[in-house]
């Protein structure tokens, strides 16, 4: 009888042993798997949104004309927000006109308040121009209202209907751009 | 697996050109963005230039007018040209994805004279 109960005692570790092999090496797989998985979901979620839907935005993004735009829930520094928008396969928002502006500051109002989110426009140290994140020049009537005083690298920041700047070190909301697909309809 | 390869550093002049690629394999490659960057000695990385799936660009200040990004989804290769190069430039360039810890080898940029 005690040589059955060790003899099943000894198959039930061996089990385990196992069990614990196989869950190690499903972990050691879910790892590396991970990172690509983390990508192709949203990649899938991103396409099968779009087609059931048939939107031209992902899911918590805003549509104007030929824009998306995700406004973030997270406070980060400017070149943080930038890479930030790049994960989605974005950039940070880039404005193009009055018109854009103004649906801008407009969404703001209605999703947010009054809060500072970072754009993705920054002031050569050297020149003191200042540059989308393209390269391009912003045209005349979108260059931030006030200059900074800061000594630090300035970046460009919306906040209620004024395009301003501040130091890129600190601490922002920040909203990213892509754009929408087209209707295949 | 997924592999970059970066090419294309050298030793350059100031004022000079590069002209940087990165191949990648696996088909995630067309997917969000694919950014350049670089690392000096004793320094952080920072990313230089990403380019979206899009086509949407984004340059580092110290680079804009004077790199230029672009990609080739057919190829899986992004691009990165490098001109008027300076002795600040020098660095070990890599390409990879935002947000995503993974990266190639590299290849060195020496701007000298």
């Known amino acids: 009888k005690l040589l059955q109960v060790s003899t099943i005692a000894m198959q039930q570790q061996e089990k385990l042993i196992q069990q614990e092999r196989a869950l190690l090496n499903f972990t050691e797989w879910k790892r590396s798997c991970a990172l690509q998985m983390k990508y192709c979901q949203a990649f899938m979620q991103n396409s099968l949104s779009s087609a059931h839907n048939s939107s031209p935005c992902p899911n918590n993004w805003i549509q104007n004309r030929e824009s998306c735009y995700y406004v973030s829930e997270i406070w980060s520094i400017w070149h943080t927000s930038q890479e930030n928008c790049l994960k989605e396969g974005s950039t940070l928002l880039q404005i193009e006109s009055k018109e854009e502006m103004d649906f801008i500051t407009g969404s703001l109002r209605k999703i947010k308040g009054s809060y500072d989110y970072w754009v993705g426009l920054s002031q050569d140290g050297h020149s003191g121009r200042w540059l989308w994140q393209d390269g391009s020049s912003p045209s005349p009537g979108l260059l931030p209202a006030e200059r900074s005083q800061s000594a630090n690298q300035v970046c460009g920041y919306v906040k209620s209907n004024s395009l301003l700047s501040s130091n890129c070190s600190t601490w922002k909301y920040f909203i990213c751009e892509k754009y929408a697909l087209r209707s295949s309809v | 697996q997924v592999q970059l390869q970066e090419s294309g550093g050298g030793l350059v002049q100031p004022g000079g050109s590069l002209r940087l690629s990165c191949a990648a394999s696996?088909?995630?490659?067309?997917?969000?963005?694919m950014g350049w960057y670089r690392q000096a000695p004793g320094k952080q990385r920072e990313l230089v230039a990403a380019i979206t799936n899009q086509g949407r660009i984004a340059y580092a200040d110290s680079v804009k007018g004077r790199f230029t990004i672009s990609r080739d989804n057919a190829k899986n290769t992004v691009y990165l040209q490098m001109n008027s190069l300076k002795p600040e430039d020098t660095a070990v360039y890599y390409c990879?994805?935002?947000?995503?810890?993974?990266w190639g080898q590299g290849t060195q940029v020496t701007v000298s004279s």
């Open positions: 990879g994805r935002p947000g995503w810890d993974y």
């Open positions: 696996g088909s995630f490659f067309s997917i969000n963005a």
